[in-house]
């Protein structure tokens, strides 16, 4: 069964910078990755970035840089502008659309006790299968 893992990491050098790492564990060809915050995509979450394997990446503020790390993992850098975007208390979700498996999504957040530079454990928490 395919799984999605999510890690949220606070940058040690810049406490206002966060990076979300997501990966897809399973067979199949990834056709699209969607990163959202505040909940799953289409279920109360706000889209932060869309990564297409061929067409590139499109992101929305406060996302700063989305990129493919490998053929099955991505990263998204975010810049916390202050009280208006309290990333430390936010849930980030990654949805991987793959063929022929369908869509798989998991969410994660920065652990409350996190020190800068530490990340959430890469425990896959499948939220839903969209199809």
């Amino acid at each position: 069964t395919p799984e999605v893992w999510v890690q949220v990491q606070m940058e040690a050098t810049e406490l206002s910078s966060f990076t979300v790492h997501c990966g897809f564990l399973g067979p199949g060809s990834i056709s699209l990755v969607t990163v959202s915050w505040g909940g799953p995509d289409g279920a109360g979450g706000t889209k932060l970035a869309v990564l297409h394997p061929e067409l590139g990446t499109r992101q929305w503020a406060p996302a700063r840089q989305a990129r493919w790390e490998t053929q099955s993992s991505i990263s998204l850098a975010l810049e916390d502008s202050g009280a208006s975007s309290p990333f430390a208390n936010t849930t980030f979700c990654c949805k991987f659309a793959s063929f022929p498996e369908g869509s798989w999504e998991s969410c994660g957040s920065l652990p409350p006790s996190s020190d800068p530079g530490l990340s959430a454990p890469p425990t896959p928490v499948p939220i839903l299968r969209a199809d």
Epitope: I30, H52, P53, E54, L55, G56, T57, R58, Q59, W60, A63, Q65, A66, R67, W68, E69, T70, Q71
Partner: antibody
């Protein structure tokens, strides 16, 4: 063949707003994002933002998010960009551009541009 | 934002000569999924709107003469015109189409002697 039609010029007063149009023809209007690009005389190109005509979703360059507002009218296959609180810094040629899904941010088709002059 | 830097700012060449112009990005434009470089080149002739020449660093757009050759990877890119023609008089801009916001270089002005 893809065509993006823009008015040639607009003369506007400082402090006012202007709404620029871009009429699309020759392709399915809702099939690709519409981009807007600024070019000051003798200078380079700056991406202002983009709009998805199928759902109205927008994405702005942070530099222009309080300056430009992008909208579309499906009935006329026209994209609009409103520029507010105009100053001399806004005097420029503004292009609309669409893509053919070669990549998200390749701008394959360009309008002829609208020259905006801000002067009292 | 990714910063794009072009050089030289201008150059003058004779018809038939080989022209090369450079574009550097402040970070890699290499897509980790498919190893493609997300860089485009545009040509803007006097009084006209820009025209897409090359995307993915080396893929010519349809109808673009094969004398226009894009190359490079990572952060360093080059546009070469193998044998410049009088109609190539124009400004040339590179642009990263890697991510939002897409950003352009300052341009290289090509003059014909």
């Amino acid at each position: 063949q893809v065509q993006l039609q823009q008015p040639g010029a607009e003369l506007v007063k400082p402090g006012t707003s202007v709404k620029l149009s871009c009429k699309a023809a020759g392709y399915i209007f809702t099939s690709s994002w519409m981009h807007w690009v600024k070019q000051r005389p003798g200078q380079g190109l700056e991406w202002i933002g983009e709009i998805n005509p199928s759902d109205g979703r927008t994405n702005y360059n942070e530099k222009f998010k309080n300056k430009a507002t992008l909208t579309v009218d499906h009935s006329s296959s026209t994209a609009y960009m409103q520029l507010s609180s105009l100053t001399s810094e806004d005097s420029a040629v503004y292009y609309c551009a669409s893509n053919a899904d070669r990549a998200y941010y390749t701008m394959d088709y360009w309008g002829q541009g609208t020259s905006v002059t801000v002067s009292s | 934002d990714i910063v794009m830097t072009q050089s030289p700012s201008s150059l003058a060449m004779s018809v038939g000569q080989k022209v090369t112009m450079s574009c550097k990005s402040s970070q890699s434009l290499l897509n980790g999924f498919n190893q493609r470089n997300f860089l485009a080149w545009y040509q803007q002739k006097p009084g006209q709107s820009p025209k897409l020449l090359v995307y993915f660093a080396s893929t010519r757009d349809s109808g673009v003469p094969d004398r226009f050759i894009g190359s490079g990877s990572g952060t360093d890119f080059t546009l070469t015109i193998s044998s410049v023609q009088a109609e190539d008089l124009a400004d040339y801009f590179c642009q990263q189409h890697y991510s939002t916001p897409p950003t352009f270089g300052g341009g290289t002005k090509l003059e014909i002697k």
